[in-house]
């Protein structure tokens, strides 16, 4: 382990600060990790990583004169399971070849970059689920239809905050497996198309605070179970709840809107298919009661992934087998904002 | 092989001036990632860094010493100087100089060294 | 500037003997994964001989027997099992920032 200027220790590499102008040639083939750290590389040339069998993580940070990633730079990289590309303002073009074949990706950031556009990711064809967290690049504006088909065959989770984004297209989220998408401070975001989740399962969480956002999709939320739609002011109504047919969490922006979950019976309908199956019944009724109270959303500041990264998911919900729906929701109303008030009485309503 | 010879010790009074010179071999300065510098060691004490340059005329000093020493080379004939003034006598040491690789910024090679003794 | 103290200063020890040097630095040597920690040889009228180099890479042509461990403030050269041509001042140094500075080093004597 041991390069003429880059930093080493057990096969971990760090090229940084301003003597590195470019991507050495000759960086051991077997490295691990990559971190391009405060260098003054422009552009990182075609097939820059080709050959590197056994890494696992690249990082591209703090590059504050990077203007080009090219095609192929991300491309048939069998062990590479995390790609950071962040702080590098400069950077306003990421070839739509650039990633390619990463069957083994699991974390792809970009954040604090100048790109104009979401990455090309249709060729990434992972096969763990991923983590796509793209932020803080006041740039992008729009997401395409099909902006994340082929990004992995399991599912995904997108954190696509704090960017500039003010349009979003139906059929946008079509071809994946959706478990989260944080669309928060995106502050320029006014609609959610009725057809956005069209050709996509999920989202099972979905975080629009602080948007403008007026209203949620009609289609598409058949398995939200949480929802976060903080300070998002604009938000004055919510899909019918039959919509919402698993939601468990809401944090919202209104107290009223908690109003419309109180006592909401699901109907039979409604629940899940293994529900009916009578052996079950008792046990179904013994796990939710074990279960207990859930934790409330409002003080999940942060989202399930991020404390970890195990991507494993959860079990069955058997929540899904109660006939009476416990949505924990938040800010609860109070004296000053009853439910009676717009709920109580058909003269108030 | 790379080889490391320093010159230009010896006894000089305090307030005087010296100039060391490293002649280097095995290596060239000109190559990406090369460094030279200087590390000196009190009599009967530990190591304490001078200064060093890097291939790309980059130099560095310990701030406690870059008032009084600078540092120059002649790429042609493979030589380093120190250029070393206002000595005191906490300067008496011998004088090492070393081949730095930038890559983790390893010591890799060094010189035997030259006495330096500041005395009146 | 980062300091750096050894201990112990000095130690006796027999040859066969598995002896440990540790160096504390007054804040953390590393930076972005890697630590800037490196050990030093020195015997009697020679100039030191770098063993390992962040932290815990050998260099090469050095014996086995040294290894080192370590991250952040706290590291240890390790001497699995002392040889007579081990009877030497040991020290640490760290270049994560300039100046690069060394501990006061560690003497290993025979028993």
């Known amino acids: 382990c041991h390069h003429r200027i880059c930093h080493c220790s057990n096969r971990v590499f760090l090229c940084q600060e301003s003597k590195v102008t470019e991507i050495p040639s000759d960086l051991p083939r077997n490295a691990i990790e990559l971190r391009f750290v405060l260098t003054k590389l422009r552009v990182i040339q075609k097939g820059a990583f080709s050959g590197f069998g056994d890494l696992e993580k690249i990082e591209i940070s703090q590059n504050d004169v990077l203007e080009v990633i090219e095609a192929d730079v991300f491309s048939n990289l069998p062990k590479l399971h995390e790609i950071r590309i962040e702080k590098a303002n400069n950077l306003l073009y990421i070839n739509p070849e650039a990633f390619q074949n990463l069957p083994n990706l699991q974390y792809l950031l970009i954040s604090n970059t100048g790109i104009k556009h979401l990455p090309d990711v249709h060729k990434i064809h992972s096969l763990q689920k991923v983590l796509l967290d793209i932020q803080d690049n006041i740039n992008i504006h729009t997401i395409e239809r099909n902006s994340f088909v082929g990004l992995s065959f399991e599912s995904v989770i997108l954190w696509l905050n704090k960017n500039g984004i003010q349009e979003i297209h139906n059929c946008a989220f079509n071809g994946t497996q959706l478990d989260e998408l944080n669309l928060s401070d995106n502050n320029n975001l006014e609609e959610l198309p009725n057809d956005v989740f069209h050709g996509a399962s999920g989202p099972v969480i979905l975080d629009i605070s602080r948007t403008r956002i007026h209203s949620l999709p009609s289609y598409g939320l058949e398995n939200l179970k949480k929802l976060r739609a903080r300070s998002t002011y604009n938000l004055k109504k919510l899909p019918t709840l039959e919509k919402l047919v698993a939601l468990m969490e809401a944090s919202l922006t209104y107290p009223s809107h908690c109003c419309a979950f109180a006592n909401w019976r699901r109907q039979i309908s409604e629940l899940h298919p293994i529900c009916n199956k009578s052996i079950l019944r008792q046990e179904v009724d013994y796990m939710t009661q074990a279960r207990g109270q859930r934790s409330s959303l409002a003080e999940d500041n942060e989202s399930s992934y991020s404390r970890g990264f195990d991507m494993t998911y959860t079990e069955f919900d058997y929540d899904l087998c109660n006939e009476v729906v416990d949505v924990t929701c938040s800010p609860k109303p109070d004296a000053f904002n009853p439910c009676e008030d717009i709920m109580g009485y058909n003269i108030l309503r | 092989e790379v080889q490391l010879v320093e010159s230009g010790g010896g006894l000089v009074q305090p307030g005087g001036s010296l100039r060391l010179s490293c002649s280097f071999s095995?290596?060239?300065?000109?190559?990406?990632?090369?460094?030279v510098g200087w590390i000196r060691q009190a009599p009967g004490k530990g190591l304490e860094w001078v200064a060093h340059?890097?291939?790309?005329?980059?130099?560095r000093y310990n701030p406690a010493l870059k008032s009084r020493f600078t540092l120059s080379v002649d790429r042609s004939k493979n030589t380093l100087y120190l250029q070393m003034n206002s000595l005191r006598a906490e300067d008496t040491a011998t004088y090492y100089c070393?081949?730095?690789?930038?890559?983790?910024?390893?010591?890799?090679?060094w010189g035997h060294g030259t006495l330096v003794t500041v005395s009146s | 500037d980062i300091q750096m103290t050894q201990s112990p200063s000095s130690l006796s020890a027999s040859v066969g003997d598995r002896v440990t040097i540790s160096c504390r630095a007054s804040?953390?040597?590393?930076?972005?994964?890697?630590?800037?920690l490196n050990w030093f040889q020195q015997k009697p009228g020679k100039a030191p001989k770098l063993l390992i180099y962040?932290?815990?890479n050998q260099r090469s042509g050095v014996p086995s027997r040294f290894s080192g461990s370590g991250s952040g403030t706290d590291f240890t050269l390790t001497i699995s099992s002392l040889q007579p041509e081990d009877f030497a001042t040991y020290f640490c140094q760290q270049s994560k920032e300039v100046p690069w500075t060394f501990g006061q080093g560690t003497k290993v004597e025979i028993k």
């Open positions: 095995g290596f060239s300065l000109s190559t990406s990632g090369m460094g």
């Open positions: 340059i890097w291939w790309d005329d980059d130099k």
């Open positions: 962040a932290a815990s």
């Open positions: 804040e953390s040597v590393d930076n972005y994964g890697i630590s800037f």
């Open positions: 070393v081949q730095i690789n930038y890559g983790n910024y390893r010591f890799d090679n």
